[in-house]
């Protein structure tokens, strides 16, 4: 729909979901909380010095499959983990870095809790 | 169609409690965010707080913590607000409202509450 | 909290005429993720609880007449009424849902000559 001025209401409109974000908290969340029309994530990766990093937080609706698609990346471990069922759901995310024999597949399956 | 119904008008005594209602129907709860808006006579409007009636997940103003206590009731699709310790400062009308953003699309006719010996 | 305000906090107008109020916002409501501004307006006619006319700045909601134009971008914002009509009589409240706690603007009343 047009943002500028002469569009009317899309039916059903998307209900707001509420996620829990850290080391990826938007300028508008408030107490470690984000707002979302998508899904909420959580994922772990290997820093510079191979040490793991767990971020979470929110992800719109537009391209959220293919974020939420696990595809492993050549010489990067890293897994991401989605949900939707309710607020804070990402709370009960725990993603676990893939073994070093994956990270040359090509392709990974979507992760949705 | 959508509507939000309250009871038109409360009476209570100072340092009581009050459990106002608002009846949602002619939509699926669920797929609202229900909200709760004070506006004191002649004055502006204030947001206390929302809940999601689909995990009962509650998000409040600051000003209200301790105030206000947002329940539902999925079964009757009724969703209410608790106002405690009252004082006149909470003579209010009292709106309720829905929203799937956080903006409110669809409001409540409002209860007047009056605080008042 | 972001501090909403309105002016002027009244007007009065002939029918047929162009109609024009803002709001101002303490701090910008612009998401940079979907370049949308989380601003809605309402009007609240006398003994009536209030009714969305726009929302995301200048999305019309359904139903809605199309002399109400919403306006702006970042932290000014302009609501216009391109004729007055005599059931326009009311008060105007804008209000921010970028971050909680929602806040609304003081109002604006406008009452027809």
């Known amino acids: 729909k047009k943002e500028d001025g002469e569009s009317t209401a899309p039916t059903p409109r998307p209900k707001i979901l509420r996620c829990k974000c850290h080391h990826h908290c938007p300028e508008d969340s408030v107490n470690n909380i984000c707002s979302t029309d998508g899904y909420c994530f959580t994922m772990i990766e290997e820093d510079d010095s191979g040490m793991p990093v767990v971020t979470s937080g929110c992800l719109g609706l537009e391209g959220s499959d293919f974020q939420c698609r696990d595809t492993p990346i050549p010489h990067q471990r890293r897994s991401i983990e989605c949900c939707t069922e309710r607020n804070e759901c990402n709370k009960d995310l725990h993603p676990t870095l893939p073994p070093l024999k994956n990270r040359d597949f090509v392709d990974g399956p979507i992760h949705h809790k | 169609q959508v509507q939000l119904q309250q009871p038109g008008a409360e009476l209570v005594m100072p340092g009581a409690s009050v459990k106002l209602s608002c009846k949602a129907s002619?939509?699926?709860?669920?797929?609202?965010?229900m909200h709760w808006v004070k506006q004191r006579p002649g004055q502006g409007l204030e947001w206390i707080g929302d809940?999601?009636?689909?995990?009962?997940?509650?998000n409040y103003n600051h000003k209200f913590k301790g105030k206000a206590t947002l329940t539902v009731d999925k079964s009757s699709s009724t969703a209410y607000m608790q106002l405690s310790s009252l004082t006149s400062e909470d003579s209010a009308v009292y709106y309720c409202?829905?929203?799937?953003?956080?903006?409110?699309?669809?409001w409540g006719q409002g209860t007047t509450l009056t605080v008042s010996s | 909290d972001i501090v909403m305000t309105q002016s002027p906090s009244s007007l009065a107008m002939s029918v047929g005429q162009k109609v024009t109020m803002s709001c101002k916002s303490s701090?910008?409501?612009?998401?940079?993720?979907?370049?949308?501004?989380?601003l809605a307006w309402y009007q609240q006619k006398p003994g009536q609880s209030p009714k969305l006319l726009v929302y995301f700045a200048s999305t019309r909601e359904s139903g809605v007449p199309d002399r109400f134009i919403g306006s702006g971008s970042g932290t000014d914002f302009t609501l216009t009424i391109s004729s007055v009509q005599a059931e326009d009589l009311a008060d105007y409240f804008c209000q921010q849902y970028y971050r909680i706690p929602w806040t609304f603007g003081g109002g604006t009343k406008l009452e027809i000559k």
């Open positions: 809940i999601d009636p689909s995990d009962t997940y509650t």
């Open positions: 701090q910008s409501l612009l998401k940079s993720s979907n370049q949308k501004n989380y």
């Open positions: 409202a829905r929203s799937g953003w956080d903006y409110f699309d669809s």
């Open positions: 002619g939509y699926t709860l669920t797929n609202y965010w």
